[in-house]
């Protein structure tokens, strides 16, 4: 049950994360005009990965797409690429994870196959989340660099009297959406990987062998060095690690190095 819950939650968290990454990528507010000393502005500028917009005091908004590829900064192209890779990986991960969900039965799919698919989708979510976080962070770094550069030459004199006010840009809403979404996708991926461990049928290289002593039998289990008295169900030659499918409600106790008597 815990495995199913972890897997299901991982899927939902990743789904929300990827939706957020898509939303952030499409948003126009990656950078917004810095309203330093001027909270009310007649013309408000903001920019996204695909277009830049201007909103006037009337509410009239005009957006212009970046209709060039070669003319754009390499960093912007890199951010676009990272976000798209993140979306593609996330989408594939979602597709894979749907089939991997324990609560969904597809033909006679083995648990081992579901475990592998869960792990695959988990890794994809992790990489997707990292791509989004990296993309947003690169853009944020670019903004910080440009911000201080434009602050240094805020007013560039032109012929003494005339001044050109440089528009400074600061973090837009899309950056925060991207960071949160990337984090959620990453967390979802980790949860899927954790769920995979619970799904995977554990196999040992050894069969458990019972050594029959003259008095009463003691079964030595190679996995965990845990002695068991011969009374009860463990007196037969029985594999301690059952390779068969477990029910999802089964509480599995794995031997560990601390499990000794």
């Amino acid at each position: 049950m815990a495995v199913t819950a972890c897997q299901g939650l991982g899927f939902v968290v990743s789904l929300i994360g990827i939706a957020g990454i898509i939303a952030a990528t499409c948003m126009d507010q990656w950078s917004t005009q810095d309203l330093y000393n001027n909270p009310v502005t007649a013309v408000f500028n903001y920019q996204g990965l695909w277009r830049s917009c201007v909103r006037e005091s009337s509410g009239f908004t005009e957006c212009r797409g970046y209709f060039t590829l070669l003319g754009l900064p390499a960093m912007l192209q890199a951010v676009r690429a990272l976000m798209i890779v993140g979306i593609v990986l996330g989408a594939i991960g979602l597709l894979v994870s749907i089939f991997a969900l324990k609560c969904i039965r597809i033909g006679s799919m083995e648990d081992s196959a579901k475990a592998n698919m869960t792990l695959t989708s988990g890794i994809m979510f992790i990489v997707s989340g990292l791509c989004a976080i990296a993309g947003v962070s690169v853009f944020a770094n670019m903004l910080v660099t440009n911000f201080w550069m434009s602050t240094a030459n805020m007013y560039t004199g032109m012929g003494g009297m005339v001044q050109t006010v440089q528009t400074r840009y600061t973090f837009g809403a899309a950056l925060f959406v991207g960071w949160v979404a990337g984090g959620l996708t990453l967390i979802g991926g980790v949860m899927m990987c954790i769920a995979c461990r619970g799904l995977a049928p554990e196999e040992t290289n050894y069969k458990a062998v019972s050594y029959h002593a003259s008095g009463h039998s003691v079964a030595y289990k190679p996995g965990g060095f845990k002695a068991s008295t011969g009374f009860g169900s463990n007196t037969k030659n029985k594999k301690i690690y059952d390779g068969g499918a477990r029910t999802e409600d089964e509480v599995q106790s794995y031997p560990s190095k601390h499990d000794y008597v």
Partner: antibody
């Protein structure tokens, strides 16, 4: 058609206050900023400030911040500007103007109220 | 605040003549985001309120005759009347529409001979 109606003239004594009105019609009052502009006799235009009827949010020219107070009455589609502590310097024609949709322009103007401050 | 300087302060021309008037701003009115200049021109006839002629430095308001043309960018702007008519007798004001507080030029008075 868009109309901004203002009373023709107001006569007030120095030190008093006056509330100038501007009744809008022919458009959705709450969708556009309302600006106020002053023109002293034989002089140019000075922007006083603006108010958004929907939100009530205002933006003043620093020069008029302590002099003018902008308000609106949505029910009657009327904008008001209260001028306080009046002196002869405040004698001027006061225009209300609708903020245009494009270019931060002022696209429709009232006829103006001629304010005379005299004892 | 942005200071708007208009020149000349007055102009006397004959009908059907071409006239140009200048407006300079102390700061650039060009917005980098959309490459538009936030300068507006108004016409004020005697005893009337101002009337919007041109916004974005060169876009004519609907109903404004095409003899009125706005041009310029950054800090230097011009209003041209290609063929002056008697009804064009007025004071012409330019206005900074880029940043608050909005500021107006002192006006150019156009007189017809």
């Amino acid at each position: 058609q868009v109309q901004l109606q203002q009373p023709g003239a107001e006569l007030v004594k120095p030190g008093a206050s006056v509330k100038l009105s501007c009744k809008a019609s022919g458009y959705t009052f709450t969708s556009y900023w309302m600006h106020w502009v002053r023109q002293r006799p034989g002089q140019g235009l000075e922007w006083i400030g603006m108010i958004h009827p929907n939100s009530g949010s205002t933006n003043y020219n620093g020069k008029f911040k302590s002099k003018a107070t902008l308000t609106v009455d949505k029910s009657s589609s009327t904008a008001y500007m209260q001028l306080s502590s009046l002196t002869s310097e405040d004698s001027a024609v006061y225009f209300c103007a609708r903020g245009g949709y494009y270019g931060n322009s002022l696209d429709f103007w009232g006829q103006g109220t001629s304010l005379t401050v005299s004892s | 605040d942005i200071v708007m300087t208009q020149s000349p302060s007055s102009l006397t021309v004959t009908a059907r003549e071409k006239v140009t008037m200048s407006c300079k701003s102390s700061q650039s009115l060009l917005n980098s985001g959309n490459q538009k200049n936030y300068l507006t021109w108004y016409q004020q006839k005697p005893g009337q309120p101002p009337k919007l002629l041109i916004y974005w430095a060169s876009t004519r308001e609907s109903g404004v005759p095409d003899r009125f043309t706005g041009s310029g960018s950054g800090t230097d702007f011009t209003l041209t009347i290609s063929s002056v008519q008697a009804e064009d007798l007025a004071v012409y004001y330019c206005q900074n529409a880029y940043s608050y507080p909005f500021t107006f030029g002192s006006g150019t008075k156009l007189e017809i001979k």
